[in-house]
Interface confidence: medium
């Protein structure tokens, strides 16, 4: 007779990342008896929800249920039926919903309410939908990457998780770039965190961490682009905007109503005597970079040192993992290699932005034009943000590691969020034996 495999004693968790531009569903899995160990939780599935971010459903909330269906059905397939009722589901909304809430708490609540009702219809253990703070987003991203890198384990590891990993217990800083906000989180070296809003204290696995974090709302790549356009059209005072951040020959008509729809452009708002304007690309990295720098106010700083807009930033310390859009954009531009210096990145961006739009479309025929057209801006913005915004230098650039996944799990805030909400990161070091190597798939 054939041996029947013993049922796996595993647990699952689901986190939906409701970002400004889209929603993604992540399914995590871990051995039930090892849930307090570090490094045991791993991602088994990512499902990208078709369509925009949930904040865009404000005028059509009745469509939210259908919008979430495909990915929730996928979760139903991936997770064994016997586990459905024990599987927690969390939805965290980020900066897109923070912006909507700034405009109208009532509208934001209405969207979340419909999201909650839709998710409650599934056979999982729904734990709620909420807008997480920028501080949480930064903190959970930091927890995720350090958990996956094994930085919280006090035991000496006998294998290396990632090629750029250092074998010490120094944590990595986290750099997260979304569509509407960007977060910087790290442990400063013996530095007082001068601004209480930016200070976090954690005790994880028996060790204390004093962490600096800040989330810059409106400085995600999409909102930064809206800001730049709103700033530039003020000066252009014309129905045509020659824009160095788009490829030569690129043309696009923008509605002024769309430009001023977001709270991020309010500071640049003016009465324009036209309803639309046309962007005409001129593809010049240097000019694009200069234009982006005008979004960062570096003249005001009430602390010993600042990032921009008067926000305290301690001296950078150690290695950093740059993920989410930092990774996606740099991956597209083929600039994620550890060997590519900052000078080389700049040179390659100059060449890329100068390429004619028709040539770019031919070279990247499979990429949606909406995304393709914005890589010149996004790449230039990433350089501007890291160098002038966060004060990385040509030398410290080599401490930035563009990370998509670590051991098969996406770098981002969702894993850290779930670990926290399921109490899977103990304050004290658990008394358990090391995992066998085979546990890491």
């Amino acid at each position: 007779t054939q041996n029947k495999a013993l049922p796996e004693n595993v647990k699952y968790g689901i986190v939906l990342d409701a970002g400004s531009s889209h929603t993604s569903l992540y399914i995590y899995k871990w051995p039930a008896e090892k849930e307090n160990d570090t490094g045991v939780v791993h991602q088994v599935e990512e499902c990208r929800v078709k369509g925009p971010g949930i904040s865009k459903f404000v005028q059509k909330v009745n469509e939210i249920g259908i919008y979430l269906t495909d990915c929730m059905e996928r979760a139903r397939e991936v997770i064994p039926r016997s586990q459905h009722q024990e599987t927690p589901v969390y939805l965290g909304a980020t900066a897109g919903m923070r912006l909507l809430r700034m405009e109208s708490e009532e509208l934001a609540d209405r969207v979340l309410d419909v999201v909650e009702r839709s998710l409650s219809n599934y056979p999982f253990d729904f734990q709620g939908a909420r807008i997480i703070t920028g501080q949480e987003e930064g903190a959970y991203g930091w927890i995720t990457i350090n958990y996956l890198l094994g930085k919280f384990s006090q035991k000496t590891r006998w294998f290396s998780i990632v090629p750029y990993e250092t074998n010490n217990q120094e944590t990595f800083g986290a750099l997260d770039l979304g569509g509407a906000s960007t977060q910087v989180t790290f442990v400063p070296q013996n530095q007082t965190i001068e601004s209480p809003d930016n200070a976090l204290q954690f005790r994880l696995y028996g060790k204390d961490y004093n962490v600096y974090t800040h989330s810059f709302l409106c400085y995600g790549k999409d909102q930064a682009l809206w800001q730049k356009l709103a700033k530039d059209i003020q000066v252009a005072s014309n129905e045509i905007l020659r824009d160095p951040c788009f490829h030569p020959g690129y043309k696009k008509v923008v509605n002024v109503s769309d430009l001023y729809k977001t709270p991020c452009t309010k500071r640049f708002e003016m009465t324009l005597p036209f309803q639309q304007f046309e962007i005409q690309g001129i593809g010049n990295y240097q000019q694009c970079h200069q234009s982006i720098l005008e979004l960062f106010n570096t003249s005001y700083c009430p602390y010993s040192q600042c990032a921009f807009n008067g926000i305290f930033l301690p001296p950078l310390q150690g290695d950093f993992g740059a993920f989410s859009a930092f990774y996606f954009v740099m991956k597209f531009l083929n600039l994620t290699s550890e060997k590519v210096s900052q000078e080389k990145v700049t040179e390659m961006m100059k060449k890329f932005c100068a390429q004619p739009w028709e040539e770019i479309k031919t070279s990247y025929a499979g990429v949606k034009e909406k995304y393709l057209s914005e890589y010149c801006f996004s790449g230039t913005y990433i350089l501007s943000l890291l160098l002038q915004g966060y004060h990385f230098t040509a030398d410290s650039w080599e401490h930035i590691h563009f990370i998509g996944k670590i051991q098969g799990s996406d770098a981002g805030w969702t894993l850290g969020y779930m670990l926290n909400l399921t109490n899977m990161i103990p304050a004290e070091q658990p008394l358990s034996t090391p995992l066998s190597h085979s546990t890491y798939v």
Epitope: D232, A236, S237, N238, E239, R242, P244, Q287, Q290, E294
Partner: antibody, heavy 119, light 107 residues
Framework: EVQLVESGGGLVKPGGSLKLSCAAS????????MHWVRQAPEKGLEWVAY????????YYADTVKGRFTISRDNAKNTLFLQMTSLRSEDTAIYYC????????????WGQGTTLTVSS | DIQMTQSPSSLSASLGERVSLTCRAS??????LNWLQQKPDGTIKRLIY???TLDSGVPKRFSGSRSGSDYSLTISSLESEDFADYYC?????????FGGGTKVEIK
């Protein structure tokens, strides 16, 4: 080759009117905003007026507001400056210049046409 | 209105000499500044835009720079055709305003 050629200048009595023209060639006129700038004898440059590519925006210097009107005919590639209630201090060489943010802000100028307001 | 204070109003220099002209803005103009050259016959030519970008066809001896609200035009080695009037122009807001001009003469 980009060319801007002003015409219509001359001698006018105070209180009189005159219309200046600027003929454009060598570029897509309908894409560009256009300016009038003047220079009084032995003085520096003074901005006078601006009109956007589609004529929806018009800006004027306080010194000419209510007296001067800027207009354009995109079909004929021509810019105009209608001047009324002229004063002696309007005596100057009048230049037209084209404008397109980011890289073509007042990048090409005409050679100028002279207006003299005198009794 | 934004005032552009240009200095010096005139300067005498010899061929091959290095000269610098400065414009100070009364309010933030964020690098929205052109440098123009006006020849004795009245012809006006833009040399620099966005504070530091050289126009195509303009000799490399011309350069523009910015330090806070001060903007400079430098000619590294004067040539005979450089003797002219120079103006700065801000285009950060309306009304557009010019500096008072600098006359560069042969010593």
């Amino acid at each position: 080759e980009v060319q801007l050629v002003e015409s219509g200048g001359g001698l006018v009595k105070p209180g009189g009117s005159l219309k200046l023209s600027c003929a454009a060639s060598g570029f897509t006129f309908s894409d560009y905003g256009m300016h009038w700038v003047r220079q009084a004898p032995e003085k520096g440059l003074e901005w006078v007026a601006y009109i956007s590519s589609g004529s929806s925006i018009r800006y004027y210097a306080d010194t000419v507001k209510g007296r001067f009107t800027i207009s354009r005919d995109n079909a004929k590639n021509t810019l105009f400056l209608q001047m009324t209630s002229l004063r002696s201090e309007d005596t100057a060489i009048y230049y037209c210049a084209r404008d397109l943010y980011y890289d073509h802000v007042l990048d090409y100028w005409g050679q100028g046409t002279t207006l003299t307001v005198s009794s | 209105d934004i005032q552009m204070t240009q200095s010096p109003s005139s300067l005498s220099a010899s061929l091959g000499e290095r000269v610098s002209l400065t414009c100070r803005a009364s309010q933030e103009v964020s690098g929205y500044l052109n440098w123009l050259q006006q020849k004795p016959d009245g012809t006006i030519k833009r040399l620099i835009y966005a504070a530091s970008t050289l126009d195509s066809g303009v000799p490399k001896r011309f350069s523009g720079s910015r330090s806070g609200s001060d903007y400079s035009l430098t000619i590294s080695s004067l040539e005979s055709e450089d003797f002219a009037d120079y103006y700065c122009l801000q285009y950060a807001s309306y009304p557009r305003t010019f500096g008072g001009g600098t006359k560069v003469e042969i010593k």
